[in-house]
Amino acid sequence: SPEVWVQVQMEATNLSSFSVHCGVLGYSLISLVTVSCEGFVDAGRTKLAVLHPEFGTQQWAPARQAHWETPNSVSVTLTMGQSKARSSLANTTFCCEFVTFPHGSRVACRDLHRSDPGLSAPTPALNLQAD
């Protein structure tokens, strides 16, 4: 069964820009990837990007760019004001959902307030499975 991972990387030189990386491990056909966050703009879940293998990508602010990094992983770059970034990120959770065949939907989330200050430590992602 495929396993989804999530990692967040903050740019060392620019605190207002950071990237969410996520991917799936194992043998599966990827049909759609959705990257979202909670606790960032408001209490609800905000869709940041949708990536389709054939039809390309779509992203919404504050996501600036979304792209495939490998056939099994994607990256979404977010940009915002520096002060807003510092205050907002503390309570933000980023989630990645991979819709795969034949396994269905796999979601992993990364809870930023439990990460170290650099936000780049490879701590295990929470794996939620919904077929």
Partner: antibody, heavy 123, light 106 residues
């Protein structure tokens, strides 16, 4: 232009392990996956697995699962492939290659490739 | 795993000939198909990616076509430097290579 330079030839005994390195220069190492492909004498190409350096996560071909470990060191822009429990059938040239794509779709291919490392398994 | 079957496994041709190599996937892979050329003692070289896109610097006599399960690499007019082994590769679910097609001088 990214270049991949691999470590030198190795001669190993059956049952032992080998670790081959692949150093990238001239580009951003962590922004693309590195795959490992092997080719036995007179045979075709076989994908073994690949690693995404940013996360350190690796995917492996089913055939090699449990016997191969692919790692990466971002600080030295180097990827490694370790194959354990070597047997004579593992005698091959081992190549590293960079997963390259356009980004906006899921199309990826291997370019560039390392020069290859010959691993000979013999008692 | 997705199996890739190439045919023929070898062929003999003359300079100027039109050469066609086929690759069949065990299941649909859309257009996630690449072609490589390999010469003895050298690393493979990318020719075609995404089934039909010509890699920069590759001569236009090389072309690729197909989608789903059946793909073709065509060399419109074989040149002396084209005698080599050609491999297809799927990149839809992880990666798999075809068995190769050796193009020899007749």
């Amino acid at each position: 232009q990214v270049q991949l330079v691999q470590s030198g030839a190795e001669v190993k005994k059956p049952g032992s392990s080998v670790k081959v390195s692949c150093k990238a220069s001239g580009g951003t190492f962590s922004s693309a996956a590195i795959s490992w492909v092997r080719q036995a004498p007179g045979q075709g190409l076989e994908w073994m697995g690949g690693i995404f350096p940013i996360s350190g996560h690796a995917n492996y071909a089913q055939k090699f699962q449990g016997r191969v470990t692919i790692t990466a060191d971002e600080s030295t822009s180097t990827a490694y492939m370790e194959l354990s429990s070597l047997r004579s059938e593992d005698t091959a040239v081992y190549y590293c290659a960079r997963d390259t794509g356009r980004g906006y779709t899921r199309h990826f291919w291997f370019d560039p490739w390392g020069q290859g490392t010959l691993v000979t398994v013999s008692s | 795993d997705i199996q890739m079957t190439q045919s023929p496994s070898s062929l003999s041709a003359s300079v100027g000939d039109r050469v066609t190599i086929t690759c069949r996937a065990s299941q649909s892979i859309s257009s996630y198909l690449n072609w490589y050329q390999q010469k003895p003692g050298k690393a493979p070289k990318l020719l075609i990616y995404a089934a039909s896109s010509l890699q920069s610097g590759v001569p236009s006599r090389f072309s690729g076509s197909g989608s789903g399960t059946d793909f073709t690499l065509t060399i419109s007019s074989l040149q002396p430097e084209d005698f080599a082994t050609y491999y297809c590769q799927q990149s839809d679910i992880l990666y798999t290579f075809g068995g190769g097609t050796k193009v020899e001088i007749k």
